[in-house]
């Protein structure tokens, strides 16, 4: 629209930046006229470095525009961010950045996995987008229940483990020995009467993984940020619900000697069958009444559930009787067991379908005389507390 | 008439991380411009600390990208500054403001005043 | 990075004076990019100067600014007491954005 006012100067035409246009375009602009700048797709308008998201000049009374042109500059996403455990490939070329650009992110491959393909385009927002239009970065997730033990499905004596057999191994020092299972790169499972106590007090709580020999010097350190104990677990009533959860300050960086184990997939129980042989390594007492130095394990059968609870009938542990909430596992004679300083250790079993490692049970209670005749070890069933573990990880 | 207003600790530990919030009223943030963080040290030197835009897009002055993030809450018209690590050379009274393009659309808030000390 | 360099750092003037003081760029800056800000004890800086040259909303005509390329500055054709404060130019031309370091003037 023109408002023509004699007294004042003509502004001097417009030119559109490269790649923009202007409009409205008139053969002359008098006080109060005004134009916008539109830019191109891919294009966006930059006053010096500054982006904004319109933009329009008046004609001033002395003739001038009240604003310079701006700039419509290629939209640059910018150095991807860095991806936690994995790295970042430029596709279009190097350190190209543009509308348009592709990089493609990849995981540390053998430890770590992403769901996605990775790849993402800068766009003309602005943002760096994957196919399925997620702006946030994908995630690395840690690969779980790789081991380089071999089960045989036999029997064997308890017998000292050798690097990368069991990297979910996670020693928990506090006023007693107990263990633990790494489960992500910052949370463990572990037993409620492990941690007991220490919800408030967990910096008293030592945590190291990486490691077979109990006082190594050279192992991962963490720390927990909180921890999770089953809301029906009593402490000192029996051992229903032994359960717990360990919130990690930071995340572990996974290797061949620090890697989660599985949680069970929906068909696991078909794979904990009585007979069905399990793994359960730890730091626990000994047959010779000591604390192992080195990390121990044993492989050892699942008990009829029923032949368990008639087993602790006829010798009862004090307070403590078998629930639909434990599993058993041991030998009839006796000779194989998990012991005091193994508790909130994991009881493992292969997936033969993935050939993963997963976690069965959870190390909690038995006969004072560990490995004794029909004195089975009594694990926590993780199969019954999928949900509870899920819920608390998802809501953290 | 637009406003902003800067809220925060006053006081933060060495080795912690400091969070302020800038609250704008009279202007939506997603309306346009950029939304910068300054901020002013005792012997009264200027440094621009970075922008997040109307968009969302954020830049940041490259002596402070590794420690410094900018993010926003688009329903409540506000924008935060996080600082990780800080140090006694953090000290110092931090704005947030609109900087002018170019036309005379310049706001600043009055700054609140970090103190980094154990 | 730009660098801006402002002289002198302090200054002092007379009512009725003329002032002048500059800011020095490390690199060119485009003179729509250039600003000039007043600051008072205890206050946010204010804007002054906008594009080398406009004058903010009721900044007082005795006020100007000039420059292009590397070389700016801000005129006071003549001293008020209320000028007395410090005044800072910043650039926007190109990312991260800078200020100098300052002048303050004061009267005499």
């Known amino acids: 629209h023109h408002h023509h006012h004699h007294a004042s100067q003509p502004c001097p035409d417009p030119t559109a930046p490269p790649n923009g246009h202007i409009s409205p375009v008139q053969a002359t602009y008098v006080l109060k006229d005004s134009f916008s700048v539109f830019c191109k797709t891919g294009f966006e308008l930059l006053q010096g470095s500054v982006p904004l998201k319109s933009f329009t000049a008046v004609c001033q009374k002395d003739g001038s525009w009240d604003r310079p042109i701006p700039e419509c500059s290629i939209i640059d996403c910018g150095p991807p961010d860095d991806l936690p455990n994995g790295h970042v490939d430029y596709i279009t070329g190097p350190e190209v950045t543009t509308y348009k650009a592709v990089i493609q992110y990849s995981c540390e491959e053998t430890f770590y996995t992403m769901s996605s393909n990775g790849k993402y385009v800068c766009e003309a927002d602005g943002f760096w987008t994957s196919s399925k239009g997620e702006k946030s970065l994908p995630v690395c997730k840690p690969v779980c229940g790789l081991s380089t033990h071999t089960s045989g499905g036999r029997i064997i004596g308890g017998q000292p483990a050798k690097p990368g057999d069991f990297p979910w191994q996670v020693l928990l020092l506090g006023e007693t020995t107990a263990a633990g299972a790494l489960i992500h790169d910052d949370w463990v499972l572990t037993a409620a009467h492990a941690v007991y106590g220490k919800t408030e007090a967990m910096s008293s709580l030592d945590i190291r993984m990486g490691i077979l020999k109990r006082l190594s010097l050279i192992y991962t350190q963490a720390w927990p940020e909180a921890v999770f104990i089953h809301e029906g677990y009593t402490h000192g009533a029996g051992f229903d619900n032994d359960i717990a959860l360990i919130k990690l300050k930071n995340k572990v960086t996974i290797n061949r000697n620090i890697m989660p184990i599985c949680l069970p997939r929906k068909e696991a129980a078909s794979l904990m069958k009585t007979d069905f042989v399990g793994t359960v390594a730890g730091w626990g007492l000994t047959q010779k009444g000591f604390l192992a130095r080195n990390l121990m394990f044993v492989d050892i059968p699942i008990v009829d559930h029923q032949k368990c609870a008639t087993a602790y009938t006829k010798q009862p542990y004090p307070g403590a009787k078998v629930t639909v909430n434990m599993l058993c596992a041991g030998l009839d004679r006796g000779g194989k067991d998990s012991c005091r300083g193994d508790a909130g250790g994991a009881l493992v079993f292969l997936d033969n379908e993935t050939q993963r490692w997963f976690v069965g049970g959870i190390v909690s209670w038995g006969s004072i005389n560990c490995g004794g005749s029909e004195q089975y070890g009594v694990y926590t069933k993780v199969t019954n507390y999928i949900p509870w573990i899920e819920n608390i990880i998802n809501n953290f | 008439d637009v406003q902003l207003q800067e809220s925060g600790p006053g006081l933060v530990r060495p080795s912690q991380s400091l969070s302020l919030t800038c609250t704008v009223t009279?202007?939506?943030?997603?309306?346009?411009?950029?939304w910068n963080w300054i901020r002013q040290f005792p012997g009264n030197k200027l440094e621009w600390m970075g922008y997040?835009?109307?968009?969302?897009?954020?830049s940041y002055n490259p002596s402070l990208k590794s420690r410094l993030s900018i993010t926003r809450d688009t329903s409540k018209n506000q924008f935060f500054l996080q600082l990780n690590s800080v140090s006694s050379a953090d000290t110092a009274t931090y704005y947030c403001?609109?900087?002018?393009?170019?036309?005379?659309?310049?706001?600043w808030g009055q700054g609140t005043t970090l103190t980094v000390s154990s | 990075q730009t660098v801006l360099t402002q002289s002198p750092a302090i200054m002092s003037a007379s009512l009725g004076e003329r002032v002048t003081m500059t800011c020095t760029a490390s690199?060119?800056?485009?003179?729509?990019?250039l600003l000039w800000y007043q600051q008072k004890p205890g206050s946010s800086p204010k804007l002054w100067i906008y594009?080398?040259?406009k004058l903010a909303s009721g900044v007082p005509v005795r006020f100007s600014g000039s420059g292009s390329g590397t070389s700016y500055s801000l005129t006071i054709s003549s001293m008020e007491a209320d000028d007395a404060a410090t005044y800072y130019c910043l650039q926007y031309n190109r990312s991260p954005l800078t200020f100098g370091a300052g002048t303050k003037l004061e009267l005499k």
């Open positions: 690199s060119s800056v485009s003179s729509s990019y």
């Open positions: 009279g202007y939506s943030i997603t309306s346009d411009y950029a």
């Open positions: 594009s080398t040259s």
């Open positions: 403001a609109i900087i002018s393009t170019a036309v005379d659309f310049d706001y």
């Open positions: 997040i835009s109307y968009s969302g897009r954020t």
